[in-house]
């Protein structure tokens, strides 16, 4: 029986470890600056890295610019978006800017898109300073179903900071749905 | 066999509880305002509390101004940095400020430092207002290896808000590395 | 013995699943804009949704405008607060604003209230622009005891953005207390 108990313990340790890892999808996606759209209106950002530098993904899928949920659960979602302008980049079309981020969820089954989180600020980036910078951070806890898609929309995409430490979003599963 | 099963269940409950606790390092470090460097350029903040007020640490180490990882894993890292100025503190050398935070990771094995997250804003803190305030929040999900160190760099450290609810950073382990 | 092992495994799977779910309280509360106080001074926000749209709660209680902890543990707390003003809403009493959020913890046993996190910014919302917007995000990892209460205080509540994606706060349990 002692051997049997050891076997039970051993198999359980494997099972617990394995199930724990399988149960925790995550993603941290960083901006792919080679393909940032221009313009000042709100656009969906579709180019993100998922496997270089700090970017990584597990038990989730990145496709067509969207982060796809593969496993039902409650997830913590976050985004950090940095905007910057240097005078050497040229004159701004307007000094009054609305710098915003929207984290949206799209359901394929019911084709609809909803904003989960938003953040940002109106800014007056005057010509009195040669450099301007502003970052937004949002985060929240949401129920996500398999097949649902998370995407990022921003205003003024041409002002995005292309560094991997500056403009990114991500998610990690915290718990199952009851 | 029933007694044996109870024993298996009991030992498992202990093991599960124990391993769960051991598997979840965390830290929440608050600014130690008795030793904030002066200057306006980017500096590393080395004085943080780890065991008073809201500050706490478990299964991680705080040493030489850095948060040291003791256990491989995926961690959620965050920082909240508040800057403030009151006219009674004296005159600002410049009203045009770059208020920034950088969360960096240093690997001892390969002596190199990399920025994981950055945030902040350029600000015009004019003399027309007697008080100015600004806060930055950043957060993200990162793979950390035992021995790696997390540190915080800021610009204009003399403007930091010294309250424990204002200027802090932290980490908690979410899952193991596969 | 094989049957017994299967029974041990089965009961363990149930227990593990059950205890995991029970051990993870959470809440995501969104602003109830039908009852936002007026004024510019710091006020406690007491009207939040807990069961519509993105709002949800499990193993925690929402009562009298406060999020009540039912289970000891270490929790990640977060808040996102958006302020906005459009000229069609009328003239601001002052263009110099202090837009702030305070996440506070109240202990019933020792009647005292302490700020866990704060964030915000001073703003100059001039009449030169017809629309102004600003968001704050804060987050941190805290030890909470059963019976303790979390509440949100803001300045200038009449400027709050009433959307569920804009103004919300939440918590989720990460681990037990040793």
């Amino acid at each position: 029986i002692r051997a049997e108990k050891a076997m039970v313990d051993g198999s359980w340790l494997d099972l617990a470890k394995r199930s724990k890892l399988e149960a925790q999808p995550f993603a941290h996606l960083t901006i792919n600056a080679t393909d940032i759209p221009s313009g000042s209106h709100k656009v969906s950002l579709s180019s993100w890295y998922h496997d270089r530098g700090w970017a990584k993904i597990s038990n989730m899928t990145f496709s067509n610019g969207k982060l796809i949920v593969n496993q039902d659960g409650f997830y913590y979602l976050y985004a950090n978006i940095c905007f910057r302008h240097h005078e050497t980049s040229g004159d701004l079309a307007t000094e009054y800017l609305q710098l915003m981020v929207y984290v949206t969820k799209t359901s394929i089954k019911i084709p609809s898109s909803h904003t989960l989180m938003k953040g940002g600020s109106t800014k007056y980036w005057s010509g009195n300073s040669e450099f301007h910078f502003y970052s937004i951070n949002v985060g929240g806890f949401f129920k996500l179903r398999s097949g649902e898609e998370i995407s990022i929309e921003v205003s003024n995409p041409s002002l995005l900071d292309p560094d991997q430490d500056a403009t990114y979003f991500g998610a990690f599963k915290v718990r199952d749905i009851d | 066999i029933r007694a044996e099963k109870a024993m298996v269940d009991g030992s498992w409950l202990d093991l599960a509880k124990r391993s769960k606790l051991e598997a979840q390092p965390f830290a929440h470090l608050t600014i130690n305002a008795t030793d904030i460097p002066s200057g306006s350029h980017k500096v590393s903040l080395s004085s943080w509390y780890h065991d008073r007020g809201w500050a706490k640490i478990s299964n991680m180490t705080f040493s030489n101004g850095k948060l040291i990882v003791n256990q491989d894993g995926f961690y959620y890292l965050y920082a909240n940095i508040c800057f403030r100025h009151h006219e009674t503190s004296g005159d600002l050398a410049t009203e045009y400020l770059q208020l920034m935070v950088y969360v960096t990771k240093t690997s001892i094995k390969i002596p190199s430092s990399h920025t994981l997250m950055k945030g902040g804003s350029t600000k015009y803190w004019s003399g027309n207002s007697e008080f100015h305030f600004y806060s930055i929040n950043v957060g993200g999900f990162f793979k950390l290896r035992s021995g790696e160190e997390i540190s915080i760099e800021v610009s204009n450290p003399s403007l930091l808000d010294p309250d424990q609810d204002a200027t802090y950073f932290g980490a908690f382990k979410v899952r193991d590395i596969d | 013995i094989r049957a017994e092992k299967a029974m041990v495994d089965g009961s363990w799977l149930d227990l593990a699943k059950r205890s995991k779910l029970e051990a993870q309280p959470f809440a995501h509360l969104t602003i109830n804009a039908t009852d936002i106080p007026s004024g510019s001074h710091k006020v406690s926000l007491s009207s939040w949704y807990h069961d519509r749209g993105w709002a949800k709660i499990s193993n925690m209680t929402f009562s009298n405008g406060k999020l009540i902890v039912n289970q000891d543990g270490f929790y990640y707390l977060y808040a996102n607060i958006c302020f906005r003003h459009h000229e069609t809403s009328g003239d601001l009493a002052t263009e110099y604003l202090q837009l702030m959020v305070y996440v506070t913890k109240t202990s019933i046993k020792i009647p005292s209230s302490h700020t866990l996190m704060k964030g915000g910014s001073t703003k100059y919302w001039s009449g030169n622009s017809e629309f102004h917007f600003y968001s704050i995000n804060v987050g941190g990892f805290f030890k909470l005891r059963s019976g303790e209460e979390i509440s949100i205080e803001v300045s200038n509540p009449s400027l709050l953005d009433p959307d569920q994606d804009a103004t919300y706060f939440g918590a989720f349990k990460v681990r037990d207390i040793d």
Partner: nanobody, 127 residues
Amino acid sequence: EVQLVESGGGLVQPGGSLRLSCAASGRTFSRSAMGWFRQAPGKGREFVGFITGSGGTTYYGESVKGRFTISRDNAQNPVYLQMNSLRPEDTAVYYCAVYRRTYISSTYSESSEYDYWGQGTLVTVSS
């Protein structure tokens, strides 16, 4: 790489005027507080003047008060040092530097309070 470049130096007769400029490149210092110093042959570095980032406040060394004026464009670079009523004792290499503090301290005239020095520009006042 941060660089400060001074220009505008040269030979001028006593009583004459010169305008020096200091341009920053490599990092955004256009709105930092700046200082001007000078070093005459065989002497130590002497404080000439200081200007805040907005240009709203200026301070001068005793030996140049009323004759020298520091200014900056409403927008960006550069920072100027207008030198009038020049004297032979103003002969020196003139340097600009970035003030390193957030607040204006009582030690603003000390060279240790500055960093990112330029290479300097020579001003010679002689008949």
